[in-house]
């Protein structure tokens, strides 16, 4: 019998991204997002 193993073949990395509200408007403070696999999800 053949044995099959599910393996995507790559790792999905995540990285914290920080944006400054002041860069896009008059508000102050930092906005923190999370990028997973090249997509910002939060």
């Amino acid at each position: 019998d053949a044995e099959f193993r599910h393996d995507s073949g790559y790792e999905v990395h995540h990285q914290k991204l920080v944006f400054f509200a002041e860069d896009v408007g008059s508000n102050k403070g930092a906005i923190i997002g999370l990028m997973v696999g090249g997509v910002v999800i939060a």
Epitope: Q15, K16, L17, V18, F19, F20, A21, E22, D23, V24, K28, G29, A30, G33
Partner: nanobody, 124 residues
Framework: EVQLVESGGGLVQAGGSLRLSCVAS????????MGWFRQAPGKDREFVAA????????YYEDDVKGRFTISRDNAKNSVYLQMNSLKPEDTAVYYC?????????????????WGQGTQVTVSS
């Protein structure tokens, strides 16, 4: 394009302080967010601190929070990094960099203008 020149690096004992300076020339300095990065031998370039265009917002890498302070003087086209309570692991080449708006401030890819770097060595 902005040209950036860092200064202020050197050799210091653990627990000591240094103040790095970066002077910009070229485009209007206040149009750019600024950041400091560092690169230790054999390691990747890592984020240290960032400051907004006006200086009203700052952000720090966790390890330097409470020890390092980033500031800027738009009238002098300059950004500074005050480094206190230095540790041997802070030894690296420190780079000043400029970024446009609307980009993440804590990743090197956001920055399109870089200085040549200044060496900081902390001895134990």
């Amino acid at each position: 394009e902005v040209q950036l020149v860092e200064s202020g690096g050197g050799l210091v004992q653990a627990g000591g302080s240094l103040r790095l300076s970066c002077v910009a020339s070229g485009r209007t300095f206040s149009n750019y967010g600024m950041g400091w990065f560092r690169q230790a031998p054999g390691k990747d370039r890592e984020f240290v601190a960032a400051i907004s265009r006006s200086g009203g917002t700052t952000y720090y890498e966790d390890d330097v929070k409470g020890r390092f302070t980033i500031s800027r003087d738009n009238a002098k086209n300059s950004v500074y990094l005050q480094m206190n309570s230095l540790k041997p692991e802070d030894t690296a080449v420190y780079y000043c960099a400029a970024r446009p708006s609307y980009v993440a401030v804590n990743i090197a890819a956001s920055y399109n203008n870089w200085g040549q770097g200044t060496q900081v060595t902390v001895s134990s």
